[in-house]
């Protein structure tokens, strides 16, 4: 299937040679090397790791490896003035204080520069007041509180459990509800799997463990001070008051031991239903405030973190293409971690390192890919996808003209149950075909393909005999490439069994306990799942860079467009009277989808039949495939989210991690029954249908015969 003119390896063995060179033992060794000390963005340790990776990628054989630096806004706790939360009595005395740090894991007691748990970009402040428990602080949780329970969060400190949605959305929702502070905590219901011990005896979260993380609402902007443009030496920076996405109220995370002390005293309203109860031995009362005996006690936050413009470093490696050097396939993952990064990101960075080594080995044997492969070790992902976004802003003109695909490589594992893939529909067939050729690492599937075990364990909800592939959302470094630039993107990792494990992410996410030992002892002792992920990510990159015809199938986009149109139409049809009153029609969208389907089908037929030995026609057809994703980009962006420009997909306005289809229409319809001006609201729905229909039709036309 893959071939290349510039090689001394038999073409049909190229992919096999690449895959055979990937070794689990190397991934293990690289993971160990990357996780012995913290690599927080903006620190000397992370700069040193960048230089080490640069040096090793050069040794591996890449043509060039450069550091790309930017000066971006980061956030750190004050070393001499720690952040904490108190319960204070009526005299203002602090009768309980939350912990100042996580108890370090065994073997790491003497490691310096472990950043204590904090919410990055929290403003400073010392608010005090009554507590309100807001469940997950989702949009629907605040609807329940405000509309059904008539509880007012204005002037209150809210406590929310982590999980379900991106923490930045929780903070935004709390701000909109009028809260003056937010406490985030990990409830065992979400971060403690039954029957598993807590670290260091198992992979569960101990009571003193805390999830760090940024609480920005950047909506794809990158560095908050330089939205749209790279944070380079001559950048014009906004004032902090004009910075994009910063929270306006203090926020701090705690573990469940500390949360217990706050929640056990809660009074006021009982929880509205069982979905508001976690696993702590507390009433999960909503409040506001504490119960009877403790009603005079208040909660006080002490937040002293600072925002600082700090230098970050991406590592960019190039393996020049032999035939189409001006076509870029990018494999990127971040390097910065909150602490040791045992899973996030180093389980991904170790896989990238081994992929680079394998490609380098082939190159040293005289092989080159057809297209250029760019490898990236991004910085400051944890602070808002800053490294990848700044680099893409700096190179946007090249990327929009030359970018074929972006494959993301953050954490390789979040479990060890089955494969998880999120990607553009253009890559569905690539992923299916590749996984059919790879061996499954799963117990009970010896001698079977990865496709088979994946399909059995994670079946598609729509198509029998096929695996589930999810929409791309955000919260990772593919965001700028896909949502802003319209470059076909995908990601793959091993995941947990979502049916039996309802906890959010993996329990030790962003805690000090995310160590090498966590992976080596509990998740993947043989590193066989890491190897499988390396084969999937590396195999995708290999095919994208090396196949003569790009491995994109535009017919799969047609199928999902119809599905998404049906879904958004169903949502709208919950308001049949208003649709009639305001003459809302989806005919234009369905017509555009129908046209897209027909044109995509004809294009696919031509793709089978054209003369692949004619380099001009080959390049023309490949360009139509490459630019199809680009055709879904609206240069004006989505309403109030100018850097989310993809009309088919955007991160959900209610959860950055989740992807939403036809997001413009979806947001226009959301909670429309509560809008004060229905005529205006339905007018916006009609405008969004028009934008979507036009975009789908325009994209279809890029696949038509050129003349």
């Amino acid at each position: 299937k893959s071939s290349n003119e510039a090689t001394n390896i038999t073409p049909k063995h190229n992919m096999k040679a690449f895959l055979d060179e990937l070794k689990a033992e190397n991934i293990k060794k690289f993971l160990y090397n990357f996780t012995q000390i913290p690599h927080l963005a903006g620190t000397e340790q992370n700069f040193q790791l960048a230089k080490q990776i640069q040096s090793q990628w050069k040794e591996f054989g890449l043509d060039s490896v450069e550091l790309a630096h930017y000066d971006v806004l980061l956030s750190y706790p004050n070393k001499t003035h720690p952040n904490y939360i108190s319960i204070i009595n009526e005299d203002g005395n602090e009768i309980f204080n939350t912990s100042l740090f996580e108890p370090p894991p065994p073997g790491y007691e003497n490691v310096s520069d472990i950043v204590p748990p904090f919410s990055a970009f929290s403003p400073q402040g010392m608010p005090e007041g009554d507590l309100v428990y807001v469940n997950y602080a989702r949009t629907e949780d605040f609807f329940k509180l405000e509309r059904d329970m008539k509880i007012n969060c204005s002037g209150k400190i809210v406590i929310a459990r982590y999980g379900k949605v991106f923490r930045g959305n929780k903070v935004k929702n709390a701000q909109l509800a009028g809260a003056k502070g937010v406490i985030l905590y990990s409830d065992p219901a979400d971060y403690f799997a039954p029957g598993v011990k807590s670290y260091p005896d198992g992979w569960n979260l101990p009571g003193g463990g805390v999830q760090r993380g940024n609480i920005l609402n950047l909506n794809g902007a990158g560095d908050p001070l330089t939205p749209g443009y790279p944070a380079n030496e001559y950048a014009y920076r906004r004032g902090i008051a004009e910075a994009v996405g910063l929270p306006s109220i203090p926020v701090h995370p705690i573990g469940y031991y500390d949360a217990q002390k706050l929640l056990e005293k809660m009074g006021g309203s009982a929880p509205p239903d069982s979905s508001w109860r976690g696993s702590l031995k507390v009433p999960y009362n909503v409040g506001p405030g504490f119960t009877g005996n403790f009603s005079t006690q208040k909660v006080k936050m002490h937040i002293h973190s600072t925002n600082e413009v700090t230098r970050i470093y991406n590592v960019i490696g190039t393996l020049r293409g032999a035939v189409e050097p001006d076509r870029y396939v990018i494999l990127g993952g971040h390097r910065d971690s909150w602490v040791f990064g045992g899973i996030d990101p180093q389980s991904g960075a170790a896989v990238v390192h081994e992929i680079v080594r394998s490609f380098g080995t082939l190159k040293k044997e005289g092989w080159r890919p057809r297209r250029t492969i760019l490898f990236a070790s991004w910085d400051a992902e944890e602070f808002g996808l800053l490294g990848s976004t700044e680099w893409a802003e700096e190179n946007s003109r090249l990327l929009q003209e030359r970018g074929v695909a972006y494959i993301n490589a953050d954490s390789s594992i979040e479990g060890n149950y089955t494969l998880r893939v999120d990607c553009t529909p253009l890559m569905y067939s690539l992923v299916h075909n590749l996984t059919k050729e790879l061996k499954s690492p799963d117990e009970g599937f010896e001698g079977k393909s990865l496709y088979e075990s994946w399909t059995k364990k994670s079946p598609s909800p729509e198509f029998s005999g096929m695996p589930r592939i999810s929409k791309l959302g955000s919260g990772n470094d593919f965001e700028v490439f896909f949502q802003r630039l319209g470059i076909a993107s995908g990601r793959a990792r091993y995941t947990k069994n979502w049916e039996t494990n309802k906890f959010s992410g993996y329990p030790l996410y962003h805690s000090v306990y995310e160590t090498y030992e966590l992976v080596e002892k509990f998740y993947d002792p043989m590193f066989k799942y890491h190897l499988t992920v390396a084969q999937v990510r590396g195999g995708m990159v290999f095919e994208l860079a090396n196949s003569i015809v790009l491995p994109f199938d535009c017919r799969d986009y047609a199928v999902v467009l119809r599905k998404y149109a049906d879904k958004i139409y169903s949502i709208s049809m919950k308001h049949p009277q208003e649709m009639k009153t305001y003459s809302v029609s989806f005919d234009s969208l369905f017509s555009a989808v129908k046209n897209f389907t027909e044109i995509a089908s004809k294009f696919s037929e031509r793709l089978q039949d054209f003369d692949k030995s004619n380099p001009i026609v080959l390049r023309m057809m490949n360009d139509q495939l490459m630019f199809l994703e680009r055709a879904f980009i609206d240069p004006l962006g989505l309403p109030d989210r100018p850097f989310y420009r993809h009309v088919i997909y955007a991160p959900s306005s209610h959860n950055k991690y989740a992807g939403e289809s036809f997001p413009g229409i979806y947001d226009a319809l959301f909670d429309i029954e509560s809008k004060v001006d229905p005529s205006k609201a339905w007018g916006e729905v009609k405008r969004q249908i028009y934008v979507a229909a036009f975009t789908v039709q325009a994209a279809a036309e890029t696949l038509s015969e050129v003349a």
């Epitope: 009571g207 003193g208 031991y257 217990q260 002390k261 976690g278 696993s279 702590l280 031995k281 999960y284």
Partner: antibody, heavy 120, light 111 residues
Amino acid sequence: QVQLVQSGAEVKKPGASVKVSCKASGYTFTYFDINWLRQAPGQGLEWMGGISPGDGNVNYAQKFQGRVTLTIDTSTSTAYMELSSLRSEDTAVYYCARDGNFPYYAMDSWGQGTLVTVSS
Amino acid sequence: DIVMTQSPLSLPVTPGEPASISCRSSQSLVHSNGQTYLHWYLQKPGQSPQLLIYTVSNRFSGVPDRFSGSGSGTDFTLKISRVEAEDVGVYYCSQSTHVPTFGGGTKVEIK
């Protein structure tokens, strides 16, 4: 490892008071409540009260209200139980026990016990 | 207070044979969070009590798998699948859903 070490046996006269200590080690003292229980000779276990080292909050069994005082010294990770107005029926082994936090919410570690004998 | 009633008071057993102890509470032990905080302790002769089973059915660290707990609401059972000589002592059920209380104990002894 978690350890609770109690003070030694005491012999008291009726009407006197006794103060038993319980020194904790091997864990973060402020995260776990300390319970006090007693066991009269040949009898079962009876809960007397509990104290939260994190915030000093105290709960007493109704039976002992006004006669028992629970305190803590966080600087030495030590809990204390003082029982006043002793009578002969207070002769018992007194135990401190750590109240396991999630996922146990049970008394997961016990002191060795302190025998208090009330006799004239 | 919740009253915990254990039966039997005394249980003579043969090593290798199973044993079962019953515990009944005067009211439901289901907490508002849905959990049931019913626990079992063993007090070996001359020792402090030790936790065996927490929240009805979960074995505490180091407890052999011959011990199992079950039940719901107000009725609970501790089972020993094959009694060993080291299992002798007094077994107590206890609840911590409300103010902690204990059963009167069941003395397990070798026949």
